[in-house]
């Protein structure tokens, strides 16, 4: 289950309106749901950005967001929210979603540079994308929601636009 916009634990908290919010906004007076990409930190008494803790060992509250963020950083992969998995575009080029358009169209234009899995796929082999051993470098407390995403090359603005669209 996604930790986005949900409390990591129960409880209610008063918010002092006159203070500057760590997120620049307060979101009501009882325990609240937070905007996308934030989570409720009851000890701090406010919504906090998930981005700050994605590299920290404790990302239970933002597990889905952090997996998605790490996945987006890796060229040629995208995060599928339904599957809750980091998908290799190379494994689905040809019937790819728009998130892979940039990767697949570029790769198809230059077959010399195709990765082995795509070369196999084009010659009729099917890649088993479930084996992602050694690819994850995230939380030591990730539990059952561990992601195969590996922080890697940053996406360009155009690529990010595709990922976020």
């Amino acid at each position: 289950m996604s930790g986005l916009g949900r409390s990591r634990r129960g409880g209610r908290s008063r918010v002092d309106q006159e203070e500057r919010s760590p997120q620049g906004l307060w979101t009501g007076v009882a325990m609240r749901s937070c905007p996308e990409e934030q989570y409720w930190d009851p000890l701090l008494g406010t919504c906090m950005s998930c981005k700050a803790i994605c590299n920290h060992q404790s990302q239970r509250t933002c597990a889905t967001f952090c997996r998605s963020l790490n996945c987006r950083k890796e060229q040629g992969r995208f995060y599928d929210h339904l599957l809750r998995d980091c998908i290799s575009c190379a494994s689905i080029c040809g019937q790819h979603p728009k998130q892979c358009a940039y990767f697949c169209e570029n790769k198809l234009r230059s077959p010399v540079n195709l990765p082995p899995e795509l070369r196999r796929q084009r010659s009729g082999e099917v890649e088993n994308n479930s084996d992602n051993s050694g690819r994850y470098q995230g939380s030591e407390h990730r539990g059952s929601e561990a992601s195969p995403a590996l922080p890697g090359l940053k996406l360009s603005a155009d690529q990010l636009a595709l990922v976020y669209s």
Epitope: R9, G24, D41, L43, L44, A52, N55, H56, S58
Partner: antibody, heavy 118, light 107 residues
Framework: QVQLVQSGAEVKKPGASVKVSCKAS????????MHWVKQKPGQGLEWMGY????????KYAQKFQGKVTMTSDKSTSTVYMELSSLTSEDTAVYYC???????????WGQGTLVTVSS | DIQMTQSPSSLSASVGDRVTITCRAS??????LSWYQQKPGKAPKLLMR???RLHSGVPSRFSGSGSGTDFTLTISSLEQEDFATYYC?????????FGGGTKVEIK
């Protein structure tokens, strides 16, 4: 390794202000919340408030509203805690402490003794 | 605010003794209970987070247990460097609050 180094002891007169610094190293400064904790001589620990250096967001304990102001300087990875209108009640050791995102304060500065005396 | 009550406020023990300190929260704090050790003139040091997880570098003779409102810190065999004051702290609800401390002295 993570280190929080605070400024030295201060002696102030009643009514004055004091600004204590806490310089962080060994981690990404903007990724963690910094808290301040007060300890009067021979007494326990009292939470004062926190600052998120990422965007200078702050939140203070009700007791310290109007008394404390927390700021940060990203260029030097330093947070500051300023106390105004000092009285003898403000005589204490002040600690900065990093929040570990799981409800604990995992690293602490060495403390700064502020003495208010006429 | 959540009140944290530690007991005893002080205790005398000898090297090698098993020592138990308790902390009670005024309301349910799940497992978000931390323990700190403080020596005179020094800053507190995190010993235990989330009730029973030892902080890096903390000896295994320290252990924690409990859930909800009642928690304990146990030192299985007291060593000379363990004579100090111990504080519990709840991390479940704003604002964070500390127990009054337990001073462990040499008998």
């Amino acid at each position: 390794q993570v280190q929080l180094v605070q400024s030295g002891a201060e002696v102030k007169k009643p009514g004055a202000s004091v600004k204590v610094s806490c310089k962080a190293s060994g981690y990404t400064f903007t990724n963690y919340v910094m808290h301040w904790v007060k300890q009067k001589p021979g007494q326990g620990l009292e939470w004062m408030g926190y600052i998120l250096p990422y965007n200078d967001g702050t939140k203070y304990a009700q007791k310290f509203q109007g008394k404390v102001t927390m700021t940060s300087d990203k260029s030097t990875s330093t947070v500051y805690m300023e106390l105004s209108s000092l009285t003898s009640e403000d005589t204490a050791v002040y600690y900065c402490a990093r929040y570990d995102w799981e409800g604990s304060f995992d690293y602490w500065g060495q403390g700064t003794l502020v003495t208010v005396s006429s | 605010d959540i009140q944290m009550t530690q007991s005893p406020s002080s205790l005398s023990a000898s090297v090698g003794d098993r020592v138990t300190i308790t902390c009670r929260a005024s309301q349910d704090i799940s497992n978000y209970l931390s323990w700190y050790q403080q020596k005179p003139g020094k800053a507190p040091k995190l010993l235990m987070r989330y009730t029973s997880r030892l902080h890096s570098g903390v000896p295994s003779r320290f252990s924690g247990s409990g859930s909800g409102t009642d928690f304990t810190l146990t030192i299985s065999s007291l060593e000379q460097e363990d004579f100090a004051t111990y504080y519990c702290q709840q991390g479940n609800l704003f604002p964070p609050t500390f127990g009054g401390g337990t001073k462990v002295e040499i008998k």
